[in-house]
Amino acid sequence: MGSAALEILGLVLCLVGWGGLILACGLPMWQVTAFLDHNIVTAQTTWKGLWMSCVVQSTGHMQCKVYDSVLALSTEVQAARALTVGAVLLAFVALFVTLAGAQCTTCVAPGPAKARVALTGGVLYLLCGLLALVPLCWFANIVVREFYDPSVPVSQKYELGAALYIGWAATALLMVGGGLLCCGAWVCTSRPDLSFPVKYSAPRRPTATGDYDKKNYV
């Protein structure tokens, strides 16, 4: 596969991953009420996210409440907010860096410098994925630990929410996409013939038979 194809595929994966990360960040489903026993008579499900918590009644009516005080939030929610927002912003920066280093753009002149810019974009996406992975795994660890902790009240036990799974899928896409961008940039630096167009030499004068020398054509 040519470096341009790697670049395009990598960028598409990164953009989808970025969208997924934004979705995960905003969804109030980082943890959801766990129904362990049928004898808990409850008519509602609680969802908790980074920015709000929602109560879903059995009737389908949903009521969400945005967290009032930042200081009142637990450490992991504050850290998760900072890291996921940081990852989203880093992906935004990575997008411009990647576009600048892309073969189809003229922001940077073709050559090793352009390949290095593209490589930087790929690395930034990889970092973005790692950055987003930290709060997702930290949060998941707390939810799982408390689920199995016998000291935690039954009604206060939660399960992993959809936002965490979306987040993990997004980080996977960001890291795979970033890896492909890095591979594409690496191909450019190590095999320039695979990346930039061949510079054709001017055709020689016609031979006696009137044919052009075909070796100039690929």
């Epitope: 049928h38 004898n39 450490t75 016998p150 000291s151 935690v152 009240p153 206060q156």
Partner: antibody, heavy 117, light 112 residues
């Protein structure tokens, strides 16, 4: 030997505040949920509040929700109960308890809080 | 909230006899997840703090004499004291440790 020693009780007027403390020893404080349980004179036991290991999660009984705040200082192995807007019905002996597996396995000697004008 | 109802409220006893007291919960305290019954029994002697005797319906705490026996189903529980001793005179409370708010029964008082 597990020891829980409460302090800070006394006579207080309705509407005023009081802060109870509980000094713990004989076990690794940060390894346990802790709780406050109270007992009104000649009455039964009532769970007041619980707090998780590092204080991340707190739970309250309906009668004290919004008025009482449970907290802990693991460095000092001390449990606290900040009581605000006290009412006559808050008059009770307050027990500091160790709280594993949602039951109360060790209890302090208790501290009396009297809310009266 | 889970309501705990204890009976009888008081009981006249004699040394050496077998004493039985009951505790009923308004909903099942049995967890299908870990196959446990979340009920505890406490003993409170006059002028003293409560003392945990039994947790998980039947598990005796260390140091508790084996004459104290806890049993029961999901909603109906029993504390039996075999060979009643004078030092066992106290108020006995049951508590559901299934979920918040944790609730206690009103107590059963043992009197001579």
């Amino acid at each position: 030997e597990v020891q829980l020693v409460e302090s800070g009780g006394g006579l207080v007027q309705p509407g005023r505040s009081l802060k109870l403390s509980c000094a713990a020893s004989g076990f690794t404080f940060s390894d346990y949920y802790m709780a406050w349980v109270r007992q009104a004179p000649k009455k039964g036991l009532e769970w007041v509040a619980s707090i998780s290991y590092e204080g991340r999660n707190t739970y309250y009984g309906d009668s004290v929700k919004g008025r009482f705040t449970i907290s802990r200082d693991n460095a000092k192995s001390t449990l606290y109960l900040q009581m605000k807007s006290l009412r006559s019905e808050d008059t009770a002996t307050y027990y500091c308890t160790r709280h594993p597996r949602r039951y109360f396995d060790y209890w302090g000697q208790g501290v009396m809080v009297t809310v009266s004008s | 909230d889970i309501v705990m109802t204890q009976s009888p409220s008081s009981l006249a006893v004699s040394a050496g006899e077998t004493v039985t007291m009951n505790c009923r919960s308004s909903q099942s305290l049995f967890s299908s997840g870990d196959q446990k019954k979340f009920l505890a029994w406490y003993q409170q002697k006059p002028g003293q703090s409560p003392k945990l005797l039994i947790s998980l319906a039947s598990t005796r705490e260390s140091g508790v004499p084996d004459r104290f026996i806890g049993s029961g189903s999901g909603t109906d529980f029993t504390l039996t004291i075999n060979n009643m001793q004078a030092e066992d005179l106290a108020i006995y409370y049951c508590q559901q440790h299934y979920d918040i708010p944790y609730t206690f029964g009103a107590g059963t008082k043992l009197e001579l």
